[in-house]
Amino acid sequence: LIIGFGISGRHSITVTTVASAGNIGEDGILSCTFEPDIKLSDIVIQWLKEGVLGLVHEFKEGKDELSEQDEMFRGRTAVFADQVIVGNASLRLKNVQLTDAGTYKCYIITSKGKGNANLEYKTGAFSMPEVNVDYNASSETLRCEAPRWFPQPTVVWASQVDQGANFSEVSNTSFELNSENVTMKVVSVLYNVTINNTYSCMIENDIAKATGDIKVTESEIKRRSHLQLLNSKAS
């Protein structure tokens, strides 16, 4: 969490941002809140990006003001206009691109004063893994697949029964470049699987960590997966 305060002269207001990550090709949110004002027409929101000389987005007098927007953000940004009055200056960023990563500044002017806070935005690709039993294999084998990751992640297998065991010798992981030539499909195969055990396929890069679990018994197969973004710090 980053909390910024205003500049001297006029009163300062508190602006708060949260570091976040964007999944390339999808929509993302750059979070920013501020001390609200009673009049929408008195609120100015400016989003800036370090190293970019045009604005990312500007909202003033109750509407978007895009005359100074930089070309790289054209048609891809929006604030939640109905929530500005309650202090939400968060920015929706459409079709996140790898080059959107960097340091952003949320700068606010209200009748109470000015304030700003920085936000670190990471971009990459991350997706839920799915673990299945590979019935085509000669021995009991598990196959963990996740369609989109970037940068290249690490893949680690774990088991509930053999806690702390190193499965690197009995697993094989491959990365296949997707058609857009940035993200990759992750496929990891685990051999010599025993029944009545829960196995976890953990995929992690510097942006996200995802886990796919599979419980294999004689009577059923249960699956579960979850994904967690890393480094979500508020400012």
Epitope: G51, L53, R74
Partner: antibody, heavy 116, light 107 residues
Framework: QVQLVQSGAEVKKPGASVKVSCKAS????????MNWVRQAPGQGLEWMGR????????NYAQKFQGRVTLTVDTSTSTAYMELSSLRSEDTAVYYC?????????WGQGTTVTVSS | DIQMTQSPSSLSASVGDRVTITCRAS??????LNWYQQKPGKAPKLLIY???RLHSGVPSRFSGSGSGTDYTLTISSLQPEDFATYFC?????????FGQGTKLEIK
């Protein structure tokens, strides 16, 4: 007040290179993109590219890619445009112009004549 | 690249006349349309940016309008100093592209 002052006229032979300078004053040099636009005699305006003085990042028009190099010297608030492998069609007035989306201030222009 | 088509290419008018120059883009440019005035031997000067915003120091007889692909520069009452060449330019995407120019001459 904002001023962009360009270097003087140049006469070059085909195949040579030319480097034109544009010295900025009256504003913070690293706050605005610097564009380069050229105009052949009696013709329209043609955007060549731009440089970000804050980090040296460049964007070039496809037509000039590989032949033009845009650089800056932040210590002297000066932008440079170097055009190589000159041909007669490069005879034109070359302008530097500030900002993104539109050009609010322009240099006075530098005439480059390419002749054997 | 976005193509900009300006019309007319030349225009004769008298002092006091109302004059209109149009510019058409090959695709929607979302109001990122700018107008410049250029006199012989001089650099272009910005008149209007973002379709209708007057650059500082530009007389109010100049105005701009339009949206999507079609834009217009209007001079409400021509003054002797307005006889020049006018260019439109799109700033929606790189590379910037310009119209071929409209030469405004004295009738």
């Amino acid at each position: 007040q904002v001023q962009l002052v360009q270097s003087g006229a140049e006469v070059k032979k085909p195949g040579a290179s030319v480097k034109v300078s544009c010295k900025a004053s009256g504003y913070t040099f690293t706050d605005y993109y610097m564009n380069w636009v050229r105009q052949a005699p009696g013709q329209g305006l043609e955007w060549m590219g731009r440089v970000n003085p804050a980090n040296g990042g460049t964007n070039y028009a496809q037509k000039f890619q590989g032949r033009v190099t845009l650089t800056v010297d932040t210590s002297t608030s000066t932008a440079y445009m170097e055009l190589s492998s000159l041909r007669s069609e490069d005879t034109a007035v070359y302008y530097c112009a500030r900002r993104h989306n539109y050009a609010d201030f322009w240099g006075q222009g530098t005439t480059v004549t390419v002749s054997s | 690249d976005i193509q900009m088509t300006q019309s007319p290419s030349s225009l004769s008018a008298s002092v006091g006349d109302r004059v209109t120059i149009t510019c058409r883009a090959s695709q929607d440019i979302s109001n990122y349309l700018n107008w410049y005035q250029q006199k012989p031997g001089k650099a272009p000067k910005l008149l209007i940016y973002y379709t209708s915003r007057l650059h500082s120091g530009v007389p109010s007889r100049f105005s701009g309008s339009g949206s999507g692909t079609d834009y217009t520069l209007t001079i409400s009452s021509l003054q002797p100093e307005d006889f020049a060449t006018y260019f439109c330019q799109q700033g929606q995407t790189l590379p910037w592209t310009f119209g071929q120019g409209t030469k405004l001459e004295i009738k």
